[in-house]
């Protein structure tokens, strides 16, 4: 059916399929050192890895995409590993009037799927 | 800032960057011929193309991903082209009690971005 269960075991071997991984980055890496004051080092969870057929399919569209990629690999790309949800992060940053604490909802990935 | 505008002009040339493309598929292609009765051929809009630096960034996370990919291409993948929204599609399909019309909200892409 259109809502077949996404496959959850990686056929490529441990750590090869779409998963969450933490990348350490400084404000300098991000080009943010001129406006963000804290934290000065971020633990950035990102989605990495491959999306073999039906692995962690985001939705029906991703399942279709996986199927058509198998039939027409030159025309239809394989699904790719992207965030399914995010963790909010508080940044202390400059404002015109001084310093502010602001929560960013779309900065750090919390979960991943294949879309 | 964290909310810099995503770039919208493709530096790789026409049709190379992330965009919506229509792929024609039969029920047989999708493996749905045993349960879907109509339509027998679907015009499936899908997201294809590359995501060069800051092109159509989905959000702050995608902007960070693009930046870190430039710094650590072996560790951080480039953003990839995925649906930003979907168009509902009505399928006529078999049920235990006969035939039913059902709307699928996540089947056909309507817009694309780089995530």
């Amino acid at each position: 059916s259109a809502h077949a269960h996404p496959r959850d075991s990686c056929p490529l071997g441990p750590g090869r399929c779409c998963h969450l991984e933490t990348v350490q980055a400084t404000l300098e890496d991000l080009g943010w050192s001129d406006w963000v004051l804290s934290p000065r080092q971020l633990q950035l969870s990102m989605c990495v890895g491959e999306c073999p057929h039906l692995y962690r399919s985001a939705n029906t569209h991703a399942q279709i995409k996986a199927r058509l990629h198998g039939l027409q690999p030159d025309k239809v790309p394989a699904p790719c590993c992207v965030p399914s949800s995010y963790t909010p992060v508080v940044l202390m940053h400059r404002t015109d009037s001084g310093v502010s604490l602001q929560t960013y909802d779309d900065l750090v990935a919390r979960g991943c799927h294949c879309a | 800032s964290a909310h810099a505008h995503p770039r919208d002009s493709c530096p790789l040339g026409p049709g190379r960057c992330c965009h919506l493309e229509t792929v024609q598929a039969t029920l047989e292609d999708l493996g749905w011929s045993d349960w879907v009765l109509s339509p027998r051929q679907l015009q499936l809009s899908m997201c294809v193309g590359e995501c060069p630096h800051l092109y159509r960034s989905a959000n702050t996370h995608a902007q960070i991903k693009a930046r870190l990919h430039g710094l650590q291409p072996d560790k951080v993948p480039a953003p990839c082209c995925v649906p930003s929204s979907y168009t509902p599609v009505v399928l006529m399909h078999r049920t235990d009690s006969g035939v039913s019309l059902q709307t699928y909200d996540d089947l056909v892409a309507r817009g694309c971005h780089c995530a």
Partner: antibody, heavy 119, light 112 residues
Framework: QVQLQESGPGLVKPSQTLSLTCTVS??????????WSWIRQHPGKGLEWIGA???????YYNPSLKSRVTISVDTSKNQFSLKLSSVTAADTAVYYC???????????WGQGTLVTVSS | DIVMTQSPLSLPVTPGEPASISCRSS???????????LDWYLQKPGQSPQLLIY???NRASGVPDRFSGSGSGTDFTLKISRVEAEDVGVYYC?????????FGGGTKVEIK
Amino acid sequence: QVQLQESGPGLVKPSQTLSLTCTVSGGSISSGGYYWSWIRQHPGKGLEWIGAIVYSGHTYYNPSLKSRVTISVDTSKNQFSLKLSSVTAADTAVYYCARGVEYQHFSLWGQGTLVTVSS
Amino acid sequence: DIVMTQSPLSLPVTPGEPASISCRSSQSLLHSNGYNYLDWYLQKPGQSPQLLIYLGSNRASGVPDRFSGSGSGTDFTLKISRVEAEDVGVYYCMQTLEAPPTFGGGTKVEIK
């Protein structure tokens, strides 16, 4: 509003492991992306930062205590914990949990819990 | 580790009068971004510390404007323009430029 509450045994024997838990109420420990720290205060003395944990589970420790400290988080229980091994009388202190942005701006503190190390 | 030194150790004050506490660091707390990474905390008797000032001179939410922080590099000052009875307690400065963050020894403010 968000509140922090420390809990754990008030008396620990020398050479044993001190274990404390900080329960976050009024908000989720995994939302907000704050750093969750442990800070202690020896009787009648100043404050000492022990370490912190962030949303990703990544930990930061004071080098002077690093070999004995473990901080962990349990998002399902909305708690983070401190374990300090091989304690001596010098570890007798009031232990506070606190929420900060990185290891600064500790705008939210627990009420503190006194832990005495004695046989 | 960065060493923080506060003075005086004890400060008797008269309500309505100004008060000033000094904090010195063993190395500069001025970041290349132009901000001084120094917090001030007040610990009232029998309570947990509370944040007063962050990044050298920024008042924390809900802190009365009689409190102000100043200074740069290695020398910092917390001023109370008009002391009130509720301001008694131990004041701590804390450097946050480098891990581990370190606190000053504290200044005890009490009413004369």
